[in-house]
Structure formats: C-alpha cells, structure tokens
Interface confidence: medium
C-alpha cells in the first residue's frame, strides 16, 4: 500500500480548527494477524530525508496519538490526554487517516507527518509516511477559514519506505 | 493502565495437567499477541508459545507441540495455557506477556506476576 | 531453533565504569522483510523483564543513553557507558526474527 496527502497545503486562520488527512492507497489486507499502527508527528523542512525527525504535536509524542487497529476496523483516539491539547486522530474504513487540532495559534504551523506501519506477526513489515505543511495566520491578511491546496499528482503519492 | 494478572501457584505430580489463567485489563484484549514465557528456578527465559486472542491463532514452539494448548475468552479477557505430561523439569515461573507496540515495533511490553508451577511426586 | 549464546554469564562491575555484553546467534537472525529483530530485556531482582534495545540498536522509550545496542547477521553487542547501581539484574538477548523465538542463557550484571 501507499499514503497519499490529499492536500500539501493547510492555510488557516488563529483560534480555527484543521483536520490534516492522510489517504492509505492499494490493497490492504484485513487478515486477523495483520494489524496498522498509525500516528502523527512534527517534523522540519530540509532534511535529506523528510519526516525523519520527530517533533511532538503540542507536547504530545507520536506515541502518545497513535493509534492501532485492524485492517477493517475504523479507530479514534479516545484518551483524555489528546483531547485535553485539543487533538484527536482518527481512521476509518475507508482508508482516510486524520488528526483534528482544535483552536489553531501560531505556535501550530509547521511541517506535520502522518505514518502508517502494517504489521504482521510481531513484524512491521511495510512502513510508508507522508507530509504536509500547516500554515497559522493572524491579522488583516488571515483567511477567514482553513484554505487546502492539493498536492500535485508527484506529491500525492508522497511516500517513504523506512 | 495495562495489567496481567495470572493464576495462583500449581503443586503437581507428574503426569497431571496444569492450566494457568492470564487476565488482561487496560487494552484491547483480542487485538493483540499473548505470549507465554516460563523461567526454571535458577533459569534463563524460554518461549513456549503465543496466541492472538481474536482470531484464536496460535503459534507453539515445537518442543512444546503436543502437550500445550492456548486458548483465550474475549468475553473475560483471559488467556489460559494449559501443559499436560507434566515432568519435574516442567518446575518453573510461568509468564504471560502481552504484546505493546512502540513506533510501529511490536514487542512484549506488560508481563503478568509469574505462575510457580511445581511438579513433584 | 535458533540457539543465543550470551558472555559472560557473570559481570561483575564497579560503578561508574563501562560494561560490555556479547550475544551471539546459531544463525543469522535476519528477517525475510530484512529487519533484524534482536531485542535486549534486563530482569530486575524480583521483577519481570523490561525492554532496553529494539531492532540490535534503537533504544527504547525511556532507557537512559549510556546503554546501546550494536551488531549485525550473528554478532550482538549491549554496552553501558557508566554503570549505575540501578542496572543490576540479569540481562537477556532475545531473536523475534525466527519461530520459536528465543533468549540468551541471561548475563548478570552485579556491582563490586
């Protein structure tokens, strides 16, 4: 399988809320044995290989938003500690992998990554991510809401094997 | 919080059957791996097998093959293995583990207490 | 099965000073999707295993920094920079690459 980043771009005003969307592409095998672990981090532009840093998501790790379910099974963060910084990751059946960040500041722009691993028997055995940059604005200049902008078709299937 | 609570220590004679119970609090009990893990007094750590309480998947080291049997209850949240011809070489801490995955990397991250199973005549 | 063959089986160490633990295996433990899953549990005295090293050398989620994990195909290194008195116990490798999975005989890590 493969992530795709629907959108690169996140443009939104302060105090808005964002959902960033990854997009699981290709099969996906819903055997019993056969697990997805999927979580959010920051990470930095410039790097030789992207989304090979990690920064925390307001203080919260990519531990601490993962997630990890079946492969027919959809899954959310229920855990107080993510809603109480104002996040929720979620997954659905369809393949769509998402982070909510309620009442944006600028302190929330940044460059965001979203990784997906499958395992099997103990073994993770594909591990694909994909990136996508936030933009927090204030002022005369600031959208009055979140603006996306797609990714080309190159990016759109902006994947890493690690 | 994750917890494994296990069974109270077995006295056995030889022959007999043991089965030792593993209860699972804090995650979602039929998503992951049970692995059972046992350390002879004075010992180092052997693998005798794993079960994925939701689909009932087993997977047994071979020098067991044939005397064990894991099973699990998703309605209680309880593994049991079970070792039956038992020897006095079968004296031992039994462990169960339960599988926790860190970065996408599975591994056996919550040990229940032990089970001391003792098999004399 | 794969046999894990630790040294010493005894380490006697005086803090504050480095300690080295070798693992060896009857086979190469590479897996077929080409990750090596050797893994590093330290027993505490009364305690069960907890995990210190994963995949030879990535270490885990609050393991201090002076232990780290080395090696490839057969030959395994666990190294504490300075030991602690709080690093006492026994020491185990461990290969999840290859059904049965197994353990090193253990290594005991004890203060002078």
């Known amino acids: 399988f493969k992530v795709a980043t629907p959108y690169s771009l996140y443009v939104c005003p302060e105090g808005q809320n964002v959902t960033l969307t990854c997009r699981l592409l290709g099969p996906v095998d819903k055997g019993h044995d056969v697990t997805f672990y999927k979580t959010w981090y920051r990470s930095s532009r410039g790097e030789v290989q992207t989304c090979s840093e990690r920064r925390p998501i307001r203080n919260l790790t990519f531990q601490d938003l993962h997630l990890h379910h079946g492969g027919h099974q959809a899954a959310n963060t229920s855990h107080d500690l993510a809603q109480r910084h104002g996040l929720e990751s979620a997954s659905d059946h369809h393949g769509n992998f998402s982070i909510t960040m309620r009442n944006l500041t600028l302190l929330d722009s940044g460059l965001y990554c979203c990784l997906v691993v499958e395992i099997r028997h103990h073994h993770s055995e594909h591990r694909v991510h994909g990136a996508m940059e936030l933009q927090v604005q204030t002022g005369k200049d600031a959208p009055s809401n979140c603006v996306v902008y797609p990714s080309s078709s190159q990016d759109s299937e902006n994947i890493t094997a690690a | 919080q994750v917890q494994l609570v296990q069974s109270g220590a077995e006295v056995k004679k030889p022959g007999a059957s043991v089965k030792v119970s593993c209860k699972a609090s804090?995650?979602?009990?039929?998503?992951?791996?049970i692995e059972w893990v046992r350390q002879a007094p004075g010992q180092g750590l052997e693998w005798i097998g794993e079960?994925?309480?939701?689909?009932?998947?087993?997977n047994y080291n071979e020098k067991f093959k044939g005397r064990v049997t894991m099973t699990a209850d998703t309605s209680t949240s309880t593994a049991y293995m079970e070792l039956r011809s038992l020897r006095s070489d079968d004296t031992a801490v039994y462990y169960c583990?339960?599988?926790?995955?860190?970065?996408?990397?599975?591994?056996?991250?919550?040990w229940g207490q032990g089970t001391l199973v003792t098999v004399s005549s | 099965d794969i046999v894990m063959t630790q040294s010493p089986l005894s380490l006697p160490v005086t803090p504050g000073e480095p300690a080295s633990i070798s693992c060896r295996s009857s086979?190469?433990?590479?897996?077929?999707?080409?990750?090596?899953?050797l893994e590093w549990y330290l027993q505490k005295p009364g305690q069960s295993p907890q995990l210190l090293i994963y995949?030879?050398?990535n270490r885990f989620s609050g393991v201090p920094d002076r232990f780290s994990g080395s090696g490839s195909g057969t030959d395994f290194t666990l190294k504490i920079s300075r030991v602690e008195a709080e690093d006492v116990g026994v020491y185990y490798c461990?290969?999840?690459?290859?059904?049965?999975?197994?353990f090193g005989q253990g290594t005991k890590l004890e203060i002078k």
């Open positions: 079960i994925l309480p939701g689909s009932g998947s087993t």
């Open positions: 461990f290969q999840g690459s290859h059904v049965p999975w197994t």
């Open positions: 583990a339960g599988e926790e995955v860190y970065d996408g990397y599975p591994w056996f991250g919550y």
């Open positions: 804090g995650y979602t009990f039929s998503r992951y791996w």
């Open positions: 995949k030879v050398s």
């Open positions: 086979q190469s433990i590479v897996h077929s999707n080409g990750n090596t899953y």
